[in-house]
Interface confidence: low
């Protein structure tokens, strides 16, 4: 978890002088509670946005937006703490909006946005906005939380972000697998425009089971430049096991941008359909 660039972040708007600061996720008001605290945020919305860094890289970011309730507690609102928690790692990152001037009611509802938390493909986050100061112990909570799921690199917009492109998202191998005679599989896929090696991982299963009955790894050396974008054809020999007929073929590239952590592509071959054995027709029809 990180912030997009570390340039000056702004939260000021007409009628409010505000600065964005790093936060330890433990606001001082937890330790020194105040008597009067503001109410909770209203209508917290989290959306997936995309932002360019100063270097020109494109990253997915969490666009956080919320409004204030129209009550007198805005007179005691000193700022907000924005917290993003990555659920599978428990990593948390916070920033603090510090209001340098008092809020006043005006003809429009106050609205705040922040779009600088960089998020990772295929990850889930919990986003929390806490109004400051935080409530006294046993006081009414003045925060709002929402979960936010980031699509994986298959998503059309995500595919062209820097983290996805670094893991090989633009490569479409268009894998085809056909079963040949004599217990063989013919695997064909399109090479990418990089002189790097590939690995084909074959796992075979019985018809209705999930325990593998055969595994095989096939190494494909780095292609020459004239072979880029060409089809690579590989014939794999299967183990001659009756019923070991369902195959998963996975192709793992080793691009320089992602090394051994590149996106893999796979294709499956189902077991052949068994023809229904028809009921035997008797030679004669009984007359009774």
């Amino acid at each position: 978890l990180r912030l997009l660039d570390h340039r000056a972040l702004v939260c000021s708007q007409p009628g409010l002088n505000c600065t964005v600061k790093n936060s330890t996720c433990l606001d001082d008001s937890w330790i020194h509670p105040r008597n009067l605290t503001p109410s909770s945020p209203k209508d917290l919305q989290i959306q997936l946005h995309f932002a360019h860094t100063q270097q020109g890289d494109l990253f997915p970011v969490a666009h956080i937006e919320w409004t204030l309730q129209t009550d007198a507690s805005i007179l005691y609102l000193e700022g907000a703490e924005l917290s993003v928690l990555q659920l599978n790692t428990n990593e948390r990152l916070c920033v603090r909006f510090e209001f340098l001037s008092k809020l006043r009611h005006h003809h429009r509802r106050w609205r705040f946005t922040f779009s600088h938390f960089v998020v990772d493909p295929d990850q889930e986050y919990e986003v929390t906005v806490h109004h400051l100061p935080k409530p006294i112990p046993d006081g009414d909570p003045n925060h709002q939380s929402k979960n936010f799921l980031v699509p994986d690199c298959e998503h059309a917009r995500m595919k062209v972000t820097t983290p996805c492109m670094s893991s090989g998202s633009l490569w479409d191998p268009n894998i085809t697998v056909e079963t040949l005679e004599a217990h063989q599989l013919r695997v064909s896929f399109t090479l990418w425009n990089e002189s790097t090696h590939y690995q084909i991982l074959l796992t075979s299963f019985p018809h209705m089971e999930n325990h593998s009955c055969f595994e095989h790894m096939h190494h494909i050396p780095a292609p020459r430049p004239e072979e880029f974008h060409q089809r690579s054809n590989v014939t794999l020999t299967l183990r001659n096991l009756k019923g070991c007929c369902r195959h998963q073929v996975q192709i793992q590239p080793f691009f320089s941008s992602c090394l051994n952590d590149c996106l893999r592509h796979s294709a499956t071959v189902s077991c052949p359909e068994m023809p229904d054995t028809p009921e035997p027709i008797p030679d004669y029809m009984p007359l009774w």
Epitope: N88, D120, P121, D122, Q123, P163, S167, L201, T203, N210, H211, S212, E215, M217, Q250, Q252, N260, D261, L263, R264
Partner: nanobody
């Protein structure tokens, strides 16, 4: 790319216990499945225990009921608690990680891992 570093190996008498740790570091933007493998001299590397990113576990028949795999996502660490150790458990133990959330039935297949540690030696004497 993920780097893995095992620790906790050593020598122990049969019936004793050891706890192996595997610290993962490096940029990871995806979920990972992780496993412990072992390789005795002159033998093939075999899967011992695996866990996917949903926390589903899989054990080799030879260690079922004696070994326990767990992971601490906050610390990016994988553990293997080994109890009732036997001389046949003597081997070099390797930690492995693979990107994506793997089916539980493939967790002990070494072909589905793309990052490996250097290994830690476990010796069980009778």
């Amino acid at each position: 790319q993920v780097q893995l570093q095992e620790s906790g190996g050593g020598s122990v008498q049969a019936g004793g216990s050891l706890r192996l740790s595997c610290a993962a570091s490096g940029y990871t933007s995806k979920t990972y499945h992780m496993s412990w493998f072992r390789q005795a001299p002159g033998k093939e590397r075999e899967g011992v225990a695996g866990i996917n990113s949903d926390g589903v576990t899989k054990y080799a028949d030879s260690v079922q009921g004696r070994f326990t795999i767990s992971r601490d996502n906050a610390k990016n660490t994988l553990y293997l608690q080994m109890d009732s150790l036997r001389p046949e458990d003597t081997a070099m133990y390797y930690c492995a990680a693979g990107s994506g959330n793997m089916f539980d039935f493939l967790l002990l297949s070494r072909h589905h891992y793309n990052a490996w540690g250097q290994g830690t030696q476990v010796t069980v004497s009778s």
